[in-house]
Interface confidence: low
């Protein structure tokens, strides 16, 4: 029975050219986390495997940094980075938990005047 819940940073916005931390947290379960996948819609960004460590997808290696913790740091943001991001927790014995984050990357002036810039 899956008793856990995923807490995420929810809907966040960041400034073009800046950085953002994507963070998920699995709570309310004693299941062992064997792996966390970070995906952007249908693209794999990164894998954090309990035994193998981090693997960053080559197409993102210049702009994605592992951590902090099981989170993911996106750097040099562009407007094209706007969209849904998923943290997929593979656990034993529970199975798979998925969290969703929506990131909106704003032009600098919009971010400054809109006061929507958030760091999780």
């Amino acid at each position: 029975m899956m008793t856990g819940t995923i807490e995420t940073t929810g809907n966040i916005s960041a400034e073009k050219g800046g950085s953002i931390i994507l963070q998920c947290h699995l709570s309310s379960t004693t299941a062992q986390v064997t792996q966390v996948n970070w995906e952007q819609q249908d693209q794999l960004l990164a894998i954090c495997n309990a035994d193998l460590g981090w693997h960053i997808s080559p197409s993102f290696k210049d702009r994605v940094a592992p951590g902090p913790g099981l989170g993911l740091t996106l750097q040099s943001l562009t407007v094209n980075d706007t969209g849904e991001y998923f943290c997929i927790y593979h656990t034993y014995p529970d199975g798979t938990y998925t969290g969703r984050i929506f990131l909106e990357v704003l032009e600098s002036s919009v971010a400054e005047h809109g006061a929507r810039f958030q760091i999780p």
Epitope: Q35, N37, D42, L44, A50, I88, H90
Partner: nanobody
Framework: EVQLVESGGGLVQAGGSLRLSCAAS????????MGWFRQAPGKERELVSA????????YYADSVKGRFTISADNAKNTVYLQMNSLKPEDTAVYYC????????WGQGTQVTVSS
């Protein structure tokens, strides 16, 4: 019990192609991650390619990007690794792994690329 059976390895000349298959039983590809690893003599086992839970998400090591293609057939519970433009440095034993955990491995299939 999870069982993974690789096939498709062999001896091929540089520039040639091979298609590896990994048939999984006791395990469903859906909502899981499958990976291909390789281990050359005297080297550590390295992740070559992986396919994500959605089937559309893929990972490739820099050394094989643009040459290797991973795919999955959920109906057959099989993962494939199409290897094109093979190089001598691709010579290794190739293993598939369930969910990249490192606790379920196949027996491996030898790939030898001659120059």
């Amino acid at each position: 019990e999870v069982q993974l059976v690789e096939s498709g390895g062999g001896l091929v000349q540089a520039g040639g192609s091979l298609r590896l298959s990994c048939a999984a039983s006791g395990f469903t590809l859906e909502n899981n991650m499958m990976g291909w690893f390789r281990q050359a003599p005297g080297k550590e086992r390295e992740l070559v390619s992986a396919i994500g839970w959605s089937g559309a998400s893929t990972y490739y090591a820099d050394s094989v990007k643009g040459r290797f293609t991973i795919s999955a057939d959920n109906a057959k519970n099989t993962v494939y690794l199409q290897m094109n433009s093979l190089k001598p440095e691709d010579t290794a034993v190739y293993y598939c792994a369930a969910n990249l955990r490192g606790d379920n491995w196949g027996q491996g299939t030898q790939v030898t690329v001659s120059s």
